[in-house]
Interface confidence: medium
């Protein structure tokens, strides 16, 4: 007789990543009896919420409920009804909301209040919405990629589960690029972390980790662009800004009020004799690179070594996973291959930025112009940040792996956040049973 399949004993969790430019909902699934095993949680769904980041709803909070509806309804479809009430929902807001909170704590609270009420309208176990710190964002990103790469498992494998997995237990560093901030997180080699703010201690699966992390607020790709524009318009002789970071022939009108709306441009703010200015692209990688470097203050360092803006950075160590916008931008530019050297990446960026805007629009007809127009800047910014900001070199470039997904799960902070909040990463190594009831002999 045929054995009847037993009902799956699984659990689900939902995390919403409320980023500066958009919100994404992730659904995770894992076998209930293996909660403490490493590598058992995997992503079953990603739903990108239509519209901007939640911080943009500050003047229209009544629209937040409608904004979240489609993805929350999707979660209701994906997760079996019998599991709804046991499924935790977490929302973490990142740098976009950190910036809003800097401007007005009351407005940020108001947005989060409405988000909380909207999410409480669903049949899940809503656990709260909060603005996570930059340190948490870095730490959870690091936990995610190392969990998915199997780095916390004590069992060394003779086979590789992902292309860039090495069999040793050396953890990967994490490089995360968002719209409003960027994080660098790794375990330095026998190096004391000179600034306590950048030091994290974890005990995971019976092993201690001393981790360095820093989040650079305002150095996500979108805010970095606003910074660059605000810096460059200071020295423009009129309301025309000839910009090397945009393709030749590209034109766009920018409102000065929009430019100075973000706290990230405050240091460059000045009274201008015009309300609007026009960006005119000239498409020159080298000049764009030089302009970006002016955003990094490397003249001051109170430590043995710094990244930029006086922030301590230990010597880089080991392999790094670069994800989120690091991956999306480099993937678009077709530069994620392990075989592409840093010199080759630079060469290709020079060619890409020099391509006329009309040509670019024709070549990438399906891509929204707003995004398409910014790839030259974003690609150049990524190179500048990694090379001059974090001190990667042509040699160490090969240690950067541009990662979108690992084992079908997106690289990013959300999985690590959920693992932590659901207590699924034990401090000690779980006692392994000779045969679990899911093992067949």
């Amino acid at each position: 007789t045929q054995n009847k399949a037993l009902p799956e004993n699984v659990k689900y969790g939902i995390v919403l990543d409320a980023g500066s430019s958009h919100t994404s909902l992730y659904i995770y699934k894992w076998p209930a009896e293996k909660e403490n095993d490493t590598g058992v949680v995997h992503q079953v769904e990603e739903c990108r919420v239509k519209g901007p980041g939640i911080s943009k709803f500050v003047q229209k909070v009544n629209e937040i409920g409608i904004y979240l509806t489609d993805c929350m309804e999707r979660a209701r479809e994906v997760i079996p009804r019998s599991q709804h009430q046991e499924t935790p929902v977490y929302l973490g807001a990142t740098a976009g909301m950190r910036l809003l909170r800097m401007e007005s704590e009351e407005l940020a609270d108001r947005v989060l209040d409405v988000v909380e009420r909207s999410l409480s309208n669903y049949p899940f176990d809503f656990q709260g919405a909060r603005i996570i710190t930059g340190q948490e964002e870095g730490a959870y990103g690091w936990i995610t990629i190392n969990y998915l790469l199997g780095k916390f498992s004590q069992k060394t494998r003779w086979f590789s589960i992902v292309p860039y997995e090495t069999n040793n237990q050396e953890t990967f560093g994490a490089l995360d690029l968002g719209g409003a901030s960027t994080q660098v997180t790794f375990v330095p080699q026998n190096q004391t972390i000179e600034s306590p703010d950048n030091a994290l201690q974890f005990r995971l699966y019976g092993k201690d980790y001393n981790v360095y992390t820093h989040s650079f607020l305002c150095y996500g790709k979108d805010q970095a662009l606003w910074q660059k524009l605000a810096k460059d318009i200071q020295v423009a002789s009129n309301e025309i800004l000839r910009d090397p970071c945009f393709h030749p022939g590209y034109k766009k009108v920018v409102n000065v009020s929009d430019l100075y709306k973000t706290p990230c441009t405050k240091r460059f703010e000045m009274t201008l004799p015009f309300q609007q200015f026009e960006i005119q692209g000239i498409g020159n990688y080298q000049q764009c690179h030089q302009s970006i470097l002016e955003l990094f203050n490397t003249s001051y360092c109170p430590y043995s070594q710094c990244a930029f803006n006086g922030i301590f950075l230990p010597p880089l160590q080991g392999d790094f996973g670069a994800f989120s916008a690091f991956y999306f931008v480099m993937k678009f530019l077709n530069l994620t291959s392990e075989k592409v050297s840093q010199e080759k990446v630079t060469e290709m960026m020079k060619k890409f930025c020099a391509q006329p805007w009309e040509e670019i629009k024709t070549s990438y007809a399906g891509v929204k112009e707003k995004y398409l127009s910014e790839y030259c800047f974003s690609g150049t910014y990524i190179l500048s940040l990694l090379l001059q900001g974090y001190h990667f070199t042509a040699d160490s470039w090969e240690h950067i792996h541009f990662i979108g997904k690992i084992q079908g799960s997106d690289a990013g902070w959300t999985l690590g956040y959920m693992l932590n909040l659901t207590n699924m990463i034990p401090a000690e190594q779980p006692l392994s049973t000779p045969l679990s009831h899911s093992t067949y002999v």
């Epitope: 909070v61 009544n62 937040i64 409920g65 409608i66 209701r76 009351e106 609270d109 108001r110 209040d113 409405v114 909380e116 009420r117 909207s118 409480s120 309208n121 669903y122 049949p123 899940f124």
Partner: antibody, heavy 122, light 107 residues
Framework: QVQLVQSGAEVKKPGASVKVSCKAS????????MYWVRQRPGRGLEWIGR????????KYNEKFKNRATLTVDTSISTAYMELSRLRSDDTAVYYC???????????????WGQGTTVTVSS | DIQMTQSPSSLSASVGDRVTITCKAS??????IGWYQQKPGKAPKLLIH???TLQPGVPSRFSGSGSGTDFTFTISSLQPEDIATYYC?????????FGQGTKLEIK
């Protein structure tokens, strides 16, 4: 106009259950949470729980978690509150009250039912 | 849970008097407080929401102020029809909580 009309007074014995209904009219039923609040004789107001009519999602005051059950029938825009294992100190007026979901200016209780008197006596 | 401490629990005043009731929240509730009037045998009636916004049709002698943790409800000139019990309600946290109530009587 917006109205919440509750079912009539009930007299119950200790240990029994009571189910109170609250029929909504004059607004979109699924756009507001329905809260249940009770007031014991000569006492203040205490909330029992709330339900989101669009999904059936509920939240209970810990004090009532194991005895109160909130349900809705969206086809007739009616909310129900059932209280089981009644005791004499459950004698009270039970109110339903709506609270907006989406906009922070609507979160308070702006419309209340007329109240249902439940008397628990042996 | 957020606790709301309302005072006084009862007060006696004359027609035309200025009457003040206070509510103190155990934590910051922004401006998410409402004030209700309840007459014997009737359901509570909303007078003010979001600290100071008067409901349509409510007389202007009723007002509210405050933010954070300390809130005040005022009747500028007491009228005979104002005799009732008044409650504050915090709706900042999803677990709403009421004050204990203030019973207002005419001297």
């Amino acid at each position: 106009q917006v109205q919440l009309v509750q079912s009539g007074a009930e007299v119950k014995k200790p240990g029994a259950s009571v189910k109170v209904s609250c029929k909504a009219s004059g607004y979109t039923f699924t756009n507001y949470w329905m809260y249940w609040v009770r007031q014991r004789p000569g006492r203040g107001l205490e909330w029992i729980g709330r339900i989101a009519p669009s999904s059936g999602a509920t939240k209970y005051n810990e004090k009532f978690k194991n005895r109160a059950t909130l349900t809705v029938d969206t086809s007739i825009s009616t909310a129900y509150m059932e209280l089981s294992r009644l005791r004499s100190d459950d004698t009270a007026v039970y109110y339903c009250a709506r609270s907006g979901i989406y906009y922070d200016y609507d979160w308070f209780f702006d419309v209340w039912g007329q109240g249902t008197t439940v008397t628990v006596s042996s | 849970d957020i606790q709301m401490t309302q005072s006084p629990s009862s007060l006696s005043a004359s027609v035309g008097d200025r009457v003040t009731i206070t509510c103190k929240a155990s934590q910051d509730i922004n401006k998410y407080i409402g004030w209700y009037q309840q007459k014997p045998g009737k359901a509570p009636k909303l007078l003010i929401h979001y600290t100071s916004t008067l409901q349509p049709g409510v007389p202007s002698r009723f007002s509210g102020s405050g933010s954070g943790t300390d809130f005040t409800f005022t009747i500028s000139s007491l009228q005979p029809e104002d005799i009732a019990t008044y409650y504050c309600l915090q709706y900042h946290a999803l677990l709403f909580t009421f004050g204990q109530g203030t019973k207002l009587e005419i001297k």
